[in-house]
């Protein structure tokens, strides 16, 4: 069976127009919340960590990467029942033995503090109240997201030097 | 932990962002190529397999789905050094003992022929010539892709299927 | 083709057991959450288990709960609903059906024919 | 378990009538609902997710509105075709619920 892709209607962060002016902002798609200056998807149905990571890939956006506490404050208030969990895009590097975002930046010992193991598949979630890790192979919702920005002229290459 | 369903944690349609009339054609990103109804990045540097899938997933976008040979050929086409080899959204899964794609369909038999060990940890690359599975842990460069298709109006979850 | 294929349904007696398959075909089964819901002869819908796209989390209707169990094969691209203590109540044609999303429970925008289950003695 | 409550549970009507059948949920749901329609022997089809996104394939006359407890499912012109069973579905929690449905029948 092929990859059956279904066509991405619209890039919200990087494509830039051809021909026509392009509006200054886009809208979120059905089923995300707009926040700030990000698209979120809560997902209802639950994944492990690598699937969860798959499934935002594969609608062309991201687990969710938290920059700050305001943002982790933002985002867990959106959370309205305690006993809900959401993976977020943050997991243990064995090898640099330090908790590492999915755009390979490593977290800052002044940002989330989190509860649990920094062990061999360990990943992040959230909650209303607190960040915690868990066994990557645990079944649990997800937050993806989808910068929501004005068109930058120049798109920083960084990770292709 | 066996994760709750709880209540719904967002509304799927409050906070929607007003928007002015979309363009017709987006186009590809600066640093990627339109190839076909896709933007492809070749990356640069190199990365194990699932740092090349986080990497496509921040740059929301996907490691690289191949639909078809004729497919295959256009992307090889692309690669002009024999000896550079690029890691595709592949991998066996050891548990369904298939190859799959990342967006969770498996590899038909009429697709591409796989050189090299379907066991754990095998994940699948493409050089100018041949496609062969290698140690995911493996450093190898990556491509991603993001789809390219008209904008409709209504942004329609169509494409998140 | 993008369907679903319900089959083994038939008539058994209160007590008994059947397990139902559901075959799905044109889509990527193993990104879906999927669903079984039935409807007894001339009454509505009612939904009757769930279990998420790897596997690993189910749910299912009080109704069932304890009787039923929900299983998956991705590689076979198969939705199993194994139904043991069955009761005259359980009669019903069953679905199966998948969300529009693949982050979502429900929302199904793909459903079986059914197949038809009657429980009797 | 959240219930949904459909009312009419059916409607008498002729082509190109405009009809309006809602539902109404034990407790808040946000936009998370779905409508169905029915029709003998056959399985349900989806017309409208998120409360009022119209589904691919579903013709126009059909549309959705609502948010919180109340919902609506309208046909604006109904047409031969549209004269069927339909039932809205919650999809904020588990367990998924389904309205007692309305059956739309011909004048």
């Known amino acids: 069976q092929k990859p059956s892709i279904g066509k991405c209607s619209v890039d919200i962060q990087q494509n830039r127009t051809k021909t026509t002016e392009r509006p200054d902002l886009l809208n979120c798609p059905i089923y995300w919340q707009q926040v700030q200056e990000k698209c979120l998807l809560f997902s209802h149905t639950v994944n492990p960590w690598n699937n969860s990571l798959a499934d935002c890939s594969t609608k062309e956006s991201s687990l969710l990467l938290i920059q700050d506490k305001d943002e982790l404050t933002r985002t867990q208030n959106l959370i309205h029942d305690k006993a809900i969990s959401f993976w977020i895009g943050l997991n243990f590097s064995l090898s640099e033995k330090n908790w590492k975002w999915i755009n390979g930046s490593f977290l800052s010992s002044n940002d989330l503090k989190i509860t649990g193991d920094a062990k061999e598949n360990s990943c992040v979630y959230i909650s209303q109240t607190s960040v915690y890790s868990e066994y990557c192979s645990t079944e649990m919702k997800w937050i993806c997201q989808k910068e929501l920005t004005l068109v930058r002229n120049k798109v920083s290459p960084d990770s292709w030097l | 932990q066996k994760p709750s369903i709880g209540k719904c944690s967002v509304d799927i349609q409050q906070n929607r962002t007003k928007t002015t009339e979309r363009p017709d054609l987006l186009n590809c990103p600066i640093y990627w190529q339109q190839v076909q109804e896709k933007c492809l990045l070749f990356s640069h540097t190199v990365n194990p397999w699932n740092n090349s899938l986080a990497d496509c997933s921040t740059k929301e976008s996907s490691l690289l789905l191949i639909q078809d040979k004729d497919e295959l050929t256009r992307t090889q086409n692309l690669i002009h050094d024999k000896a550079i080899s690029f890691w595709i959204g592949l991998n066996f899964s050891l548990s369904e003992k298939n190859w799959k794609w990342i967006n969770g369909s498996f590899l038909s038999s009429n697709d591409l022929k796989i050189t090299g060990d379907a066991k754990e940890n095998s994940c699948v690359y493409i050089s100018q010539t041949s496609v062969y599975s290698e140690y995911c842990s493996t450093e190898m460069k990556w491509i991603c892709q993001k789809e390219l298709t008209l904008v409709r109006n209504k942004v329609s979850p169509d494409s998140w299927l | 083709e993008v369907q679903l294929l319900e089959s083994g349904g038939g008539l058994v007696q209160p007590g008994g057991s059947l397990r139902l398959s559901c075959a799905a075909s044109?889509?990527?089964?193993?990104?879906?959450?999927m669903s079984w819901v039935r409807q007894a002869p001339g009454k509505g819908l009612e939904w009757v288990s769930a279990?998420?796209?790897?596997?690993?989390?189910?749910y299912y209707a009080d109704s069932v709960k304890g009787r039923f169990t929900i299983s998956r094969d991705n590689s076979k691209n198969t939705l199993y609903l194994q139904m043991n203590s069955l009761r005259a109540e359980d009669t019903a044609v069953y679905y199966c059906?998948?969300?529009?999303?693949?982050?979502?429970?429900?929302?199904?925008?793909?459903w079986g024919r059914g197949t038809l289950v009657t429980v009797s003695s | 378990d959240i219930q949904l409550t459909q009312s009419p549970s059916s409607v008498s009507a002729s082509v190109g009538d405009r009809v309006t059948i809602t539902c109404r949920a034990s407790q808040g749901i946000y936009s998370w609902l779905a409508w169905y329609q029915q029709k003998p022997g056959k399985a349900p089809k989806l017309l409208i997710y998120a409360a009022s996104s119209l589904q691919s394939g579903v013709p126009s006359r059909f549309s959705g509105s609502g948010s919180g407890t109340d919902f609506t499912l309208t046909i604006s012109s109904l047409q031969p075709e549209d004269f069927a069973t339909y039932y809205c579905?919650?999809?904020?929690?588990?367990?998924?619920?389904f309205g007692g449905g309305t059956k739309v029948e011909i004048k």
């Open positions: 279990i998420s796209a790897a596997g690993g989390t189910t």
């Open positions: 059906a998948k969300p529009l999303d693949s982050s979502q429970w429900a929302d199904f925008d793909l």
């Open positions: 579905q919650q999809a904020s929690d588990l367990p998924i619920t």
């Open positions: 044109g889509f990527t089964f193993s990104q879906y959450a």
